[in-house]
Amino acid sequence: MDGRFWIRVQESVMVPEGLCISVPCSFSYPRQDWTGSTPAYGYWFKAVTETTKGAPVATNHQSREVEMSTRGRFQLTGDPAKGNCSLVIRDAQMQDESQYFFRVERGSYVRYNFMNDGFFLKVTALTQKPDVYIPETLEPGQPVTVICVFNWAFEECPPPSFSWTGAALSSQGTKPTTSHFSVLSFTPRPQDHNTDLTCHVDFSRKGVSAQRTVRLRVAYAPRDLVISISRDNTPALEPQPQGNVPYLEAQKGQFLRLLCAADSQPPATLSWVLQNRVLSSSHPWGPRPLGLELPGVKAGDSGRYTCRAENRLGSQQRALDLSVQYPPENLRVMVSQANRTVLENLGNGTSLPVLEGQSLCLVCVTHSSPPARLSWTQRGQVLSPSQPSDPGVLELPRVQVEHEGEFTCHARHPLGSQHVSLSLSVHYSPKLLGPSCSWEAEGLHCSCSSQASPAPSLRWWLGEELLEGNSSQDSFEVTPSSAGPWANSSLSLHGGLSSGLRLRCEAWNVHGAQSGSILQLPDKKGLISTAFSN
């Protein structure tokens, strides 16, 4: 190459399809056969073109026709007279991809092709997107400014056309498009949250455009608060509403996880509250939803659980009534007798003594959820409840001997049943049969019987003398026997008996005594008379 001719241009130029680029270029040529007034012509050619016959892609030579495919798109913006060969390529197309070289003509001598020192134009797919600058969270009713920037700007290149679309732009105000950015002002509404706002950048060639979509985040108070429940690590379900407050039944010992989630912007602080006691809370940036774990629910975990979601724009809360179900526990009988208000707790197998004729109230008590069905049985027979509204209460206004025996309270429950039994023993004072006497060969034989509960004791009196055991003189003999509530005693009197003596049989227990007398001893023909006294 002639050392007096040189050109400086980048070796490779890359431009996205449809865009415009400016290629800086400078060159030098000898001052030979031209003056300052001699016109300087510059030409850019595709490397496939013959410079003498072919059309350049750009030139400042008005009478020279340019390549049809580049007409109006390629422009020699530099002044060849000043050694400037800068070229602008607008609306770059795939077919423009090629090697290009520059030719200068000035006067008769300077007619030179810079054949080996051109540039290669590579046209790439348009993948660049505009950048949209928008506050992270928008306040409803507060005007906001959004900027869209497309970072591709060259001198001599026309600015692209910007446009905006989005549901929030029913009444937008846009500032005029400037070189490579657009400013949009609008006032977001609550309903604009989660809607799209798109900045479109359109270039001269039809169909060549770039766009960027952002999702609007408009601040709003918590809404759509949802409580869901996961039990024993099963997937979460929403509780069933019962009235205004959802109701949840859980079995004692179950694993429960209560989950609370709310839609809000900015994210809300979530908290779980049980009867005004905060059980757990989350930071706005913490994990969502907020979980409350009850590893093995207890009866004491029952109650109203409230989830509260709160941010600077407001709050929302929802409650959940938890009922922990469990089978009967601590089943026992409380007893009130003889109108005493003092209640005693009796456990299973207790024996309960009651005085005949007294009143007795048995109250069966247990804890369970839901309440167990209570009933009383005696010797396998179901007893009618004294108070149908409270089948756990059994009232016996006058206890009779026939009431004696086992009473059982049954607590029936879907999760398991229990029963408690107590043994009722009816106490009464002695009832006396006798005494009766008869003569026998050995002497006078008398017998006396008594029934009582507890079993009575019997003793004999002859006049004022108490006859106990056997006399030392063998003058009498007492033979006791007993079976259950009966006590029997036989008295044998030997030897002479003075007439007019009074023989008495006495029966006694803790509840009282009864005695019967024979006022006149019988002759050997039988009994004369008998009198009873208590």
Epitope: E11, S12, E17, K46, A47, V48, E67, M68, S69, Q93, M94, Q95, E97, S98, Q99, F119, F120, K122, T124, A125
Partner: antibody
């Protein structure tokens, strides 16, 4: 003088991967603006452009085959390699290595072509 | 993809006669069209680029015209060596696509 020569297996089985090599001379693929393409032609049918590689290792693929194609170059060996996975009998064709005139998207230099048959 | 449709599929012409081959693009491709000639057992050969520019060494009897969507290759006076298959190609947008070809045979 610019020459291009394709080489590779004449027969491949379905599902196999085809590897074709284009060995060139008369120019350097490190020169700005230089690039090579692969084009194929099934028997008695039209030509189909497959892929292109530039001097700067930038690549272009036909979208309909992009997932199956890989083009690469070894400038020191003056070679360009095309691999095509999951071959099928419909891929039976003559495969050409071509060069664009001054980097243009029309092709002045063609290799002789290599015929590939896909059959089990 | 841009579809290039060539017609007719076969053209029967006598030597010395004029042959006109048509190529239609499914969308505007400007002048980004090239024409190739292919003889049996050979690789294609570039004839025309940019719709109307004849490639170096191509005889003057071959000429191209058209822009937008309709393009024509004309062989003014057919020589015996011109009987072959001719393909058009667009390079306006990716992917590059070729026509199905027109076979020019001796009448």
């Amino acid at each position: 003088q610019v020459t291009l020569k394709e080489s590779g297996p004449a027969l491949v089985k379905p599902t196999q991967t085809l590897t074709l090599t284009c060995t060139f001379s008369g120019f350097s693929l490190s020169t700005s603006g230089m690039g090579l393409s692969w084009i194929r032609q099934p028997p008695g049918k039209a030509l189909e452009w497959l892929a292109h590689i530039y001097w700067d290792d930038d690549k272009r693929y036909n979208p309909s085959l992009k997932s199956r194609l890989t083009i690469s170059k070894d400038t020191s060996k003056n070679q360009v390699v095309l691999t095509m996975t999951n071959m099928d009998p419909v891929d039976t064709a003559t495969y050409y290595c071509v060069r664009g005139l001054y980097g243009n998207w029309f092709f002045d230099v063609w290799g002789q072509g290599t015929t590939v048959t896909v059959s089990s | 993809d841009i579809v290039m449709t060539q017609s007719p599929a076969t053209l029967s012409v006598s030597p010395g006669e004029r042959a006109t081959l048509s190529c239609k693009a499914s969308q505007n491709v400007g002048t980004a069209v090239a024409w190739y000639q292919q003889k049996p057992g050979q690789a294609p050969r570039l004839l025309i680029y940019s719709a109307s520019n004849r490639y170096t060494g191509v005889p003057a009897r071959f000429s191209g015209s058209g822009s937008g969507t309709e393009f024509t290759l004309t062989i003014s006076s057919l020589q015996s060596e011109d009987f072959a298959v001719y393909f058009c190609q667009q390079y306006s947008s990716y992917p590059l696509t070729f026509g199905g070809g027109t076979k020019v045979e001796i009448k």
